[in-house]
């Protein structure tokens, strides 16, 4: 089982985002989008093998409108 992906790479902007609190910065298209109902993954156990990039979350976890704070320790953040 792998650790969830490690984080911040080249294209990422430094926190905080330029977005208003109810929005998130979508790195795929590089702009702010509404994220109040967005579902994202929950972290896998910080398991064995080599660390993978970015801390992942598991499908089906709901992230509310105040999703500005990371709910987990996120190793590798710049």
């Amino acid at each position: 089982m792998r650790r969830g992906p490690r984080s911040l790479r080249g294209r990422d902007a430094p926190a905080p985002t330029p977005c208003v609190p109810a929005e998130c910065f979508d790195l795929l298209v590089r702009h702010c989008v509404a994220c109040g109902l967005l579902r994202t993954p929950r972290p896998k156990p910080a398991g064995a093998s080599s660390p993978a990039p970015r801390t992942a979350l598991q499908p089906q976890e709901s992230v509310g409108a105040g999703a500005g704070e990371a709910a987990l320790p996120l190793p590798g953040l710049l």
């Epitope: 509404a34 967005l38 993954p41 990039p53 970015r54 089906q60």
Partner: antibody
């Protein structure tokens, strides 16, 4: 069970229109972005379009821009692809797929497509 | 548009073999690289996301590595059900793009 069931494929003449549907079940459809991807016979996979969970943003591949429209009805748990001005080169198996993302702080990171429909064949031929 | 080049385009291997497939991006995509398996007449299945994270339910014999422009999918011990076509896909920017696949055949 999480699944996407597709319908609407068929044989159509060049220049005509067709609408594909993708019915979602087993997950909260209205909380996920969705994609369409296609695969022409013996060819590579080609991304067609993506729509945000709430329909607020849509992006298209260059080959379909201005001809295809992605949409969704969250009350019906259904994704659509309206295909107009069809060309021979649009002949392919079309797949709907769920966008796999991670929210890190206020950043959305994209992890590809984690749930796929079974595919539906579109044949454009005169 | 980011072009993904997979190699080899096909390979023959035996059950138990270690198989390595590579994917090269035309520009740096960090770790935004995903791997899929597709069997004839079926939809693709996500195996690896973010270059090296194993998708839930995927056997641990599959692993991914790399960042920047060069990525690798490894099957540590090929099983009969692993004979399929494997695709890489970048999720760094739109348009999303796929490699053209590596077909793993029985030797």
């Amino acid at each position: 069970e999480v699944q996407l069931v597709q319908s609407g494929g068929g044989v159509v003449q060049p220049g005509r229109s067709l609408r594909l549907s993708c019915a979602a079940s087993g997950f909260t459809f209205g909380s996920y972005g969705m994609h369409w991807v296609r695969q022409a016979p013996g060819k590579c996979l080609e991304w067609v379009a993506v729509i945000w969970y709430d329909g607020s943003n849509k992006y298209y591949g260059d080959s379909v821009k201005g001809r295809f429209t992605i949409s969704r009805d969250n009350s019906k748990n259904t994704l659509y692809l309206q295909m107009n001005s069809l060309r021979d080169e649009d002949t392919a198996v079309y797949y709907c797929a769920r966008r796999f993302t991670h929210l890190r702080g206020q950043y959305i990171e994209d992890y590809g497509m984690d749930v796929w429909g079974q595919g539906t064949t579109v044949t454009v031929s005169s | 548009e980011i072009v993904l080049t997979q190699s080899p385009s096909s390979l023959s291997a035996s059950v138990g073999d270690r198989v390595t497939i590579t994917c090269r991006a035309s520009q740096s995509i960090s770790s935004y690289l995903n791997w899929y398996q597709q069997k004839p007449g079926k939809a693709p299945k996500l195996l690896i996301y973010a270059a090296s994270s194993l998708q839930s339910g995927v056997p641990s014999r599959f692993s991914g590595s790399g960042s920047g422009t060069d990525f690798t999918l490894t099957i540590s011990s090929l099983q009969p059900e692993d004979f399929a076509t494997y695709y890489c896909q970048q999720s760094y920017s739109t348009p999303l793009t796929f490699g053209c696949g590596t077909k793993v055949e029985i030797k």
